[in-house]
């Protein structure tokens, strides 16, 4: 069964990736890219670290953990449906073909509650899925908006929500990890 990571539109997504530095402060360059890991480097780079610091990043992409201790997990801020896909975490260990590569799948779900949705495409016949409409609006306009108080029609989804949050926690604890040295 495939391992994937999930977040909702408007939330932050978390993609785990770790390594254990050979010695404190002895860091290894890491790159994050969109799309599967190529033979070398990362494609469509969104963030990069060197031996000392984060030396390249793009908006919405950041490292929330202590990357100096090898936690190079990626946080993507305020996700949209367009953020769905494969992300490459590449730990660039010195030497020929020594890199560790991890392809992580990120699935973005439409927000569970969509009050007065903004412009969306082909919504007329779309159907509810976990109190959402399946995402056929331009990803960049699928905003979360302000959430109304919970009502009875939402209670039936609580089991699904619990399942999803439990899965997210399980996956958070099972991220890509390697030891160096």
């Amino acid at each position: 069964s495939e391992v994937e990571y999930r977040a909702e539109v408007g939330q932050n997504a978390y993609l785990p990736c770790f390594y254990t530095p050979a010695a404190p402060g002895n860091l290894v360059p890491v790159c994050w890219g969109k799309g599967a890991c190529p033979v070398f480097e990362c494609g469509n780079v969104v963030l990069r670290t060197d031996e000392r610091d984060v030396n390249y990043w793009t908006s919405r992409y950041w490292l929330n953990g202590d990357f100096r201790k090898g936690d190079v997990s990626l946080t993507i801020e305020n996700v949209t449906l367009a953020d769905s896909g494969i992300y490459c975490c590449r730990i660039q260990i010195p030497g020929i073909m020594n890199d560790e590569k991890f392809n992580l799948k990120l699935v973005i779900k439409p927000a569970k509650v969509t009050p007065a949705p903004t412009r969306q495409r082909d919504f007329t016949a779309a159907f509810p899925r976990m109190l959402t409409t399946r995402g056929h609006g331009p990803a960049e306009t699928q905003t979360l908006g302000s959430l109304p108080d919970i009502n009875l029609t939402q209670i039936s989804t609580l089991a699904n929500e619990l399942r999803d949050s439990r899965l997210a926690n399980d996956l958070r604890d099972s991220g890509a990890t390697i030891r160096i040295g």
């Epitope: 069964s1 999930r6 969109k34 769905s84 699935v107 779900k109 082909d122 159907f127 899925r129 056929h136």
Partner: antibody, heavy 119, light 107 residues
Framework: EVQLVQSGAEVKKPGASVKVSCKAS????????MHWMRQAPGQRLEWIGY????????KYNEKIKGKATLTSDKSSSTAYMELSSLRSEDTAVYYC????????????WGQGTTVTVSS | DIVMTQSPSSLSASVGDRVTITCKAS??????VAWYQQKPGKAPKLLIY???NRYIGVPDRFTGSGSGTDFTFTISSLQPEDIATYYC?????????FGGGTKVEIK
């Protein structure tokens, strides 16, 4: 490993119906919608519709609505497509496909089922 | 529905050649375009999604680019196993629609 296994080839007479199955494995069946496509000989791929096994929500391509009926069986993780009132122009390879999740690109496909309509 | 116009419909190239296929959408689809490879008697195989992102297991020689209405798919160095028909597909709106295909052959 995600797998979609479709039923075998069918030869039908005009006016008949046919039901094609697509058995899914390697993932939680109710977490993803199942799409159906067809490809007539020498033609481009055409999207038929999708079904959400979680709630039986269905959406069809308006251009060919009424030709196909989509159903699913959660207990066997199987999706079905029934084609009715078959005509020679319905001769095609029919595919089931799973999207990545809420976005309509398709990493996983069944092997295809050839439906031939001939008198 | 969004119409995807693909060109050329067929091409012949030598092993090692750079091959380029274009796809034009009838309206702006941002970067919501995927590319597939289909070999005779087989199902399509996803190569690229969201215009430029390679799917898992896809060789680096396959790349995609573009946004808005104009998209390009490139095989940087054609290999014998790349002989197939290639399709673009917009995933911006329902119904998803495909291009007419480009048949790639070896000279």
């Amino acid at each position: 490993e995600v797998q979609l296994v479709q039923s075998g080839a069918e030869v039908k007479k005009p006016g008949a119906s046919v039901k094609v199955s697509c058995k899914a494995s390697g993932y939680t069946f109710t977490n993803y919608v199942m799409h159906w496509m067809r490809q007539a000989p020498g033609q481009r791929l055409e999207w038929i519709g999708y079904i959400d096994p979680d709630n039986d929500g269905i959406k069809y391509n308006e251009k060919i609505k009424g030709k196909a009926t989509l159903t699913s069986d959660k207990s066997s993780s199987t999706a079905y497509m029934e084609l009715s009132s078959l005509r020679s122009e319905d001769t095609a390879v029919y595919y089931c496909a799973r999207d990545f999740g809420y976005v309509d690109w398709f990493p996983y496909w069944g092997q295809g089922t050839t439906v031939t309509v001939s008198s | 529905d969004i119409v995807m116009t693909q060109s050329p419909s067929s091409l012949s190239a030598s092993v090692g050649d750079r091959v380029t296929i274009t796809c034009k959408a009838s309206q702006d689809v941002t970067t919501a375009v995927a590319w597939y490879q289909q070999k005779p008697g087989k199902a399509p195989k996803l190569l690229i999604y969201s215009a430029s992102n390679r799917y898992i297991g896809v060789p680096d020689r396959f790349t995609g680019s573009g946004s808005g209405t104009d998209f390009t798919f490139t095989i940087s160095s054609l290999q014998p196993e790349d002989i197939a028909t290639y399709y673009c597909q917009q995933h911006y709106s329902i119904p998803p629609t495909f291009g007419g295909g480009t048949k790639v052959e070896i000279k």
